[in-house]
């Protein structure tokens, strides 16, 4: 059997839409699927690898290294998005490409980024962990780190990191899916909203969903003593 | 308010060594991204820049004059100091100490300079 | 180094005037600054990356360009305008400056 709730929930381009969220009730009533992974049912995904999940993790990530900072043009805010669901009148698309990024770094002003701009985090802005020296954060923005200290400053002059950012990785469901929404969404949909991070790739999903020890690579799924938990 | 002065001797010996110091307020050198960079214009001439050092003290030199300069920063006492050494009549010039902004830049600018100081090398 | 020249070396015009300065890189860059200088006075940014205005610059200022040619326009010549141009380059070490415009009245 299935639950479905119907609401009002703030999506990312800033305005209420009806949302529905499905659950499946459990059978035996008790306690919901995502509930039971967390007790340490045996959910494959959680002890090995799994092709489908993987895949859709890859397919996330490919599509996240194409993405920008779309920016409303009357300052209402801005998110992570692609550019064909960024609106080409009411917003700007803040994309880094040829030769309009900045430098790698400031010891190679040669070395053009192409990969973000991305909302909120910047390689120049970011003091902790600082992109510099033998730590230059890779031109592929889902292999940055989360920035966990911002430089001390009001404004930057960038319009990707002045705005107001209005969505965040959330991770929604068993399968370990992530999505950039808004905290408001999120929570509708029974996800977990990650306040500390700015792109999907900087989350693991899994890791959350599964609960119990984390994964001691949170690329791996590694709990194998599930088997003799349930 | 953001200000730089420069201070050092007006006139220097050939083979000398100059020693430049920028007094710098209004902002700290220890501030993430921040930057001081020297800069010189031989009377009448083009602007030339020298060499600049970066908060986490990374230094950055004009090739054609590397050996001959050392830039370095005391950020307690806010200040940048630049040495050239070996002086020579062609190096008579006003000496500009300035900071680097960043503010909505890919990359760096010159936003706020001092208001110079003339050195005359001559025997 | 990247050389970049500059043309004209000096130019005569009227208050009112429309004014444009080129600059030339001798390799391909990909952003261009530029600050006016006084005599006697440190110089002072007017654009950077091309075509953002400084602050407190006045809007008659713009700059446009890309690859190796690279433009400084005034709109409409002010008498405060009267003084020497230089452009910038921050692609790569060491930073060069263009040997400068001179604007002068007529």
């Known amino acids: 059997a299935q639950h479905v709730t119907t609401q009002l929930v703030l999506r990312n381009k800033g305005v209420y839409e009806s949302v529905k969220y499905i659950q499946q009730e459990n059978f035996w009533i008790g306690p919901s699927s995502i509930d039971l992974i967390h007790l340490g049912a045996k959910f494959s995904p959680c002890i090995r690898k799994d092709q489908q999940i993987e895949q859709l993790v890859l397919r996330e990530r490919d599509l996240e290294r194409d993405s920008g900072c779309c920016v409303q043009n009357d300052h209402s805010g801005c998110i992570q998005t692609q550019r064909k669901d960024c609106s080409e009148t009411l917003a700007t698309f803040v994309k880094w490409q040829d030769d309009t990024g900045p430098p790698m770094d400031k010891s190679d002003l040669g070395q053009k980024r192409t990969s973000g701009a991305v909302c909120h985090q910047d390689p120049r802005t970011c003091e902790e962990p600082a992109s510099s020296g033998a730590h230059i954060w890779p031109d592929d923005i889902t292999k940055w780190p989360i920035c966990t200290e911002q430089a001390k400053s009001n404004r930057t002059g960038f319009l990707h990191m002045d705005c107001q950012i209005k969505g965040r990785p959330c991770c929604i469901s068993t399968k370990g899916s992530c999505e950039i929404t808004t905290r408001e969404y999120c929570e509708f949909m029974h996800g977990y909203f990650h306040e500390e991070a700015t792109l999907c790739s900087q989350v693991h999903c899994l890791d959350k969903v599964c609960g119990l020890l984390p994964f001691l690579n949170p690329e791996v799924p590694d709990q194998f003593y599930r088997l003799w938990l349930s | 308010q953001v200000t730089l002065r420069e201070s050092g001797p007006a006139l220097v010996k050939p083979t000398q060594t100059l020693t430049l110091t920028c007094t710098f307020s209004?902002?700290?050198?220890?501030?993430?991204?921040?930057?001081v960079g020297w800069i010189r214009q031989p009377p009448g001439k083009a602007l030339e820049w020298l060499a600049h050092?970066?908060?986490?003290?990374?230094?950055y030199y004009n090739s054609a004059l590397k050996s001959r300069l050392t830039i370095s920063k005391d950020t307690s006492k806010n200040q940048v100091v630049l040495t050239i050494t070996n002086m020579d009549p062609v190096d008579t010039a006003t000496y500009y100490c300035?900071?680097?902004?960043?503010?909505?830049?890919?990359?760096?600018?010159?936003?706020?300079w001092g208001q110079g100081t003339l050195v005359t090398v001559s025997s | 180094a990247i050389q970049l020249t500059q043309s004209p070396s000096s130019l005569s015009a009227s208050v009112g005037d429309r004014v444009t300065i080129t600059c030339r890189a001798s390799?391909?860059?990909?952003?261009m600054f530029w600050y006016q200088q006084k005599p006697g006075k440190a110089p002072k940014v007017l654009i950077y990356?091309?075509?953002n205005l400084a602050s407190g610059v006045p809007s008659r200022f713009s700059g446009s360009g890309s690859g190796t040619d690279y433009t400084l326009t005034i709109s409409s010549l002010q008498p405060e305008d009267f003084a020497t141009y230089y452009c910038?380059?921050?692609?790569?070490?060491?930073?060069?400056f263009g040997q400068g415009t001179k604007l002068e009245i007529k």
């Open positions: 050092i970066w908060w986490d003290d990374e230094k």
């Open positions: 990356d091309t075509s």
């Open positions: 910038q380059q921050w692609n790569a070490y060491p930073l060069t």
């Open positions: 209004g902002f700290s050198l220890s501030t993430f991204g921040r930057g």
């Open positions: 300035a900071r680097i902004q960043n503010y909505g830049s890919n990359y760096w600018y010159f936003d706020v």
């Open positions: 390799s391909r860059i990909s952003y």
